[in-house]
């Protein structure tokens, strides 16, 4: 089951996946100037058996010049009407973002692949937050969200992290990188 | 489903003392912000300050800093508000709600009445 | 400390209308801005956070736009139903501000 609606945003922070649940599409997207060639997937997914999962079909982009004068409108899977996007920026993974069952990782980059990718997440996906730049945690719990299904509607759980620009010194020992706590994790919350 | 269950009405006279409390149900009550919110007989909506029950970080609007004790116990899943001396002008419905960017659930309210 | 300012404070319309709520933050806040309904007795409701997003269960009637310093709450077609007080809330910092809340009474 698809999620409806992007992960929240929340202020100062920015949020990723570590990992990507089985079933997870991710839209093959070129950058400008760069098209899918022909007959090429729309998009990646991750699948996989009882023991390993991986990516499904490749992206691939060719040069917009090689193609001929007739304008062609890129089709779009049907899910595209809501979207997820995550800048290409230096992935916050643990060692072991992979090894849980049921997941794939970060799919590798592919030549003239867009500046933004679009996920369409499943329920049971996590994303993690993190503070910007010049902004800290107020707190070491977990900072992360979880796509739900409650009363056959899909929703996001609200992020826990409050990143602020407080100059004061920090009440707990160690600053930031407190985010990917496993303690006690929101997805405990009781659906319907 | 989750639930914020909020302690019952109160009446005090001027100068006493008082806690009320907010239990979190049906989820992880640590990995959640609770908030308080006043909202005086007729008027709007006030934030009083925020609490992580898991590691009882407080943080305080600065109308209400001194005034008001924001609190957790863990054990049993509870946030508490308390007075040390309360006055006429703390009469007022007093709501818990979870955080800590948008109040997505609300606690029913307690009504606190100070008259002597 | 951030203003929440919100027009009108009292606004008196019929079943079926359109009715728009006006809430300006006193510095611009981004799309960092929540909507609750209150009705008498009761808690506040959330309707919409970051502006625009529909929290989960709420009536697609309802809509909020905006950004910056300028925010409007929507109702496409009032319903029975509707007839409360609105708020609006800042979440730039966490320390929220509301606004002072518009009344949807009958006409």
């Known amino acids: 089951e698809l999620c409806d609606d992007d992960p929240p945003e929340i202020p100062h922070a920015t949020f990723k996946a570590m990992a990507y649940k089985e079933g997870t599409m991710l839209n093959c997207e070129c950058k400008r100037g760069f098209r899918r060639i022909k007959s090429g997937s729309l998009y990646m997914l991750c699948t996989g058996n009882s023991s390993h999962s991986s990516w499904d079909n490749q992206c691939q982009c060719t040069s917009s010049a090689t193609r001929n004068t007739t304008k062609q409108v890129t089709p779009q899977p049907e899910e595209q009407k809501e979207r997820k996007t995550t800048e290409m920026q230096s992935p916050m993974q643990p060692v072991d973002q992979a090894s849980l069952p049921g997941h794939c990782r970060e799919p590798p980059p592919w030549e003239n692949e867009a500046t933004e990718r679009i996920y369409h997440f499943v329920v049971g996906q996590m994303v993690y937050y993190q503070c910007v730049q010049g902004y800290r945690a107020l707190h070491r719990g977990p900072a992360e969200s979880v796509c739900k299904m409650t009363h056959g509607k899909t929703r996001w759980t609200q992020p826990q992290l409050i990143c602020t620009g407080e100059m004061e010194t920090s009440q707990f020992p160690g600053e930031e990188k407190p985010q990917a706590s496993p303690e006690g994790r929101p997805e405990s919350e009781t659906s319907c | 489903q989750v639930q914020l269950v909020q302690s019952g009405t109160e009446v005090k006279k001027p100068g006493e003392s008082l806690k009320i409390s907010c239990e979190g149900v049906g989820y992880s009550f640590t990995t959640y912000w609770i908030g308080w919110v006043r909202q005086m007989p007729g008027k709007g909506l006030e934030w009083m300050g925020i609490i992580y029950p898991g590691d009882s970080i407080t943080r305080y609007s600065p109308s209400f800093q001194g005034q008001v004790t924001i609190s957790a116990d863990k054990s049993i899943n509870t946030a508490y508000l308390q007075w040390s001396s309360l006055m006429a002008s703390d009469t007022a419905m007093y709501y818990c709600?979870?955080?800590?960017?948008?109040?997505?659930?609300w606690g029913q309210g307690t009504l606190v009445t100070v008259s002597s | 400390d951030i203003q929440m300012t919100q027009s009108p404070s009292t606004l008196s319309a019929s079943v079926g209308d359109r009715v728009t709520i006006t809430c300006r933050a006193s510095q611009s806040i981004s799309t960092w801005l929540a909507w609750y309904q209150q009705k008498p007795g009761k808690a506040p409701k959330l309707l919409i956070y970051k502006a625009s997003s529909l929290e989960s269960g709420v009536p697609s009637r309802f809509s909020g736009s905006g950004s910056g310093t300028e925010f409007t709450l929507t109702i496409s077609s009032l319903q029975p139903d509707d007839f409360a007080a609105y708020y609006c809330?800042?979440?730039?910092?966490?320390?929220?501000?509301f606004g002072q809340g518009t009344k949807v009474e009958i006409k």
């Open positions: 709600v979870r955080g800590p960017h948008w109040g997505d659930y």
């Open positions: 809330q800042q979440y730039s910092s966490y320390s929220w501000t």
